[in-house]
């Protein structure tokens, strides 16, 4: 079998949801000594980067200017050390937002509920879309999908204090082109005093985790780079598997 290098880690800097006409930044973290990185979009080569000096840099940033629906989709990256190529990274879905219209998000029975109550979010958008998405702030990887002609419902079932937080919804014109976000709806879940004070909120991985922690090797940074690679691998699997 043909020898390959370990696959790199691809991630979006700050967020994978990029407003139309704004810039996206993708990071490909490979290995010190990599002489070339390639970014692929929907299976075709999109961009190339050659780090200098290669032995001091463990990854690169790819800038995608002027985001639009043509550049929204699945990205991956590979890298090369000498003549040896790596395996392909996992796929990263890059979404363009702020397309066309703004949906309205509401919650029933209301934004203030008691632990154990059944809650349903409703996302409404009058223009042609059939898929709706609900996201909790700070958990943008955990997208709930629902279908409907003009409105979709998102039943949450009996809620706990873990459901507390701010929610937004989008209408989706395809998997990678979303509407403007709705205004946020803040869900407040109260329990009895004992439970409320003790109930931990759901552990979140804020979007700011998705920053590009690329390092220049200076000796001391070897350990940091190793920790970073391990941590990001853990984070990646948490969200995508």
């Amino acid at each position: 079998p043909k020898q390959t290098l370990p696959k790199p880690i691809i991630r979006a800097e700050s967020t994978y949801m990029v407003p139309k006409e704004k810039q996206a930044t993708l990071c490909c973290q490979g290995s010190y000594g990599a002489v070339e990185y390639q970014l692929h979009f929907e299976g075709s080569l999109f961009a190339v980067e050659r780090p200098k000096p290669p032995e001091r840099i463990n990854g690169v940033k790819f800038h995608i200017p002027d985001m639009n629906s043509r550049k929204a989709g699945r990205y991956s990256c590979i890298y090369r050390v000498g003549e040896l190529w790596s395996e392909r990274s996992d796929l990263l879905d890059l979404v363009v937002t702020e397309m066309y219209d703004t949906p309205t998000l509401s919650v029933h029975p209301g934004p203030e509920v008691t632990s154990g109550e059944k809650v349903t979010f409703y996302c409404r958008l009058d223009t042609a879309t059939s898929m709706f998405l609900l996201l909790k702030e700070g958990r943008s990887r955990d997208v709930q999908r629902s279908y409907g002609k003009v409105q979709a419902e998102f039943p949450m079932g009996p809620v706990t204090t873990a459901h507390r937080g701010s929610y937004r919804c989008f209408g989706s014109y395809n998997n990678y082109a979303w509407s403007f976000p709705s205004e946020p709806v803040k869900l407040l879940v109260t329990g009895d005093i004992e439970n409320t004070s003790l109930a931990p909120t759901d552990p979140t991985f804020p979007d700011s985790w998705d920053t590009c922690l690329l390092t220049r090797e200076t000796g001391l940074q070897k350990d940091l780079a190793l920790w970073d690679h391990t941590a990001q691998n853990h984070h990646h699997h948490h969200h995508h598997h």
């Epitope: 080569l45 999109f46 961009a47 190339v48 980067e49 200098k52 002027d66």
Partner: nanobody, 127 residues
């Protein structure tokens, strides 16, 4: 936006050479990563060569590697494509394109990365 005008195309015999130029106006060329693409009749637009904004790193596909060389002169606001050992299959309209990227070193090979395009110059290689 930047305005791009290609020149230098023409009719040449197989094995010959041409040098295409792309003059930029409206904005300084150093603000853009640049590329050359070509389109033959009835075929899709094809990537030919690209150069990064500041570092001058270049990339070309195997079909033209060793024959075509992309370069830029930011002081003259001009992009070049030196084409040697031309083949009949190089016949096409050649376009230059600009990508307004903050990256000094990214090389863009995909047409969707480019926002500004010239009108094109015809290159015909006879056998």
């Amino acid at each position: 936006d930047v305005q791009l005008v290609e020149s230098g195309g023409g009719l040449v015999q197989a094995g010959g050479s041409l040098r295409l130029s792309c003059a930029a106006s409206g904005r300084t060329l150093s603000s853009y990563a640049m590329g050359w693409f070509r389109q033959a009749p009835g075929l899709e637009r094809e990537f030919v060569a690209a150069i990064s904004r500041i570092s001058g790193d270049t990339y070309s596909p195997d079909s033209v590697k060793g024959r075509f060389t992309i370069s830029r002169d930011n002081a003259k606001n001009t992009l070049y494509l030196q084409m040697n050992s031309l083949k009949p299959e190089d016949t096409a309209v050649y376009y230059c394109a600009a990508s307004a990227t903050p990256s000094a070193t990214n090389i863009y090979t995909n047409q969707y990365a480019y926002g500004d395009w010239g009108q094109g110059t015809q290159v015909t290689v006879s056998s």
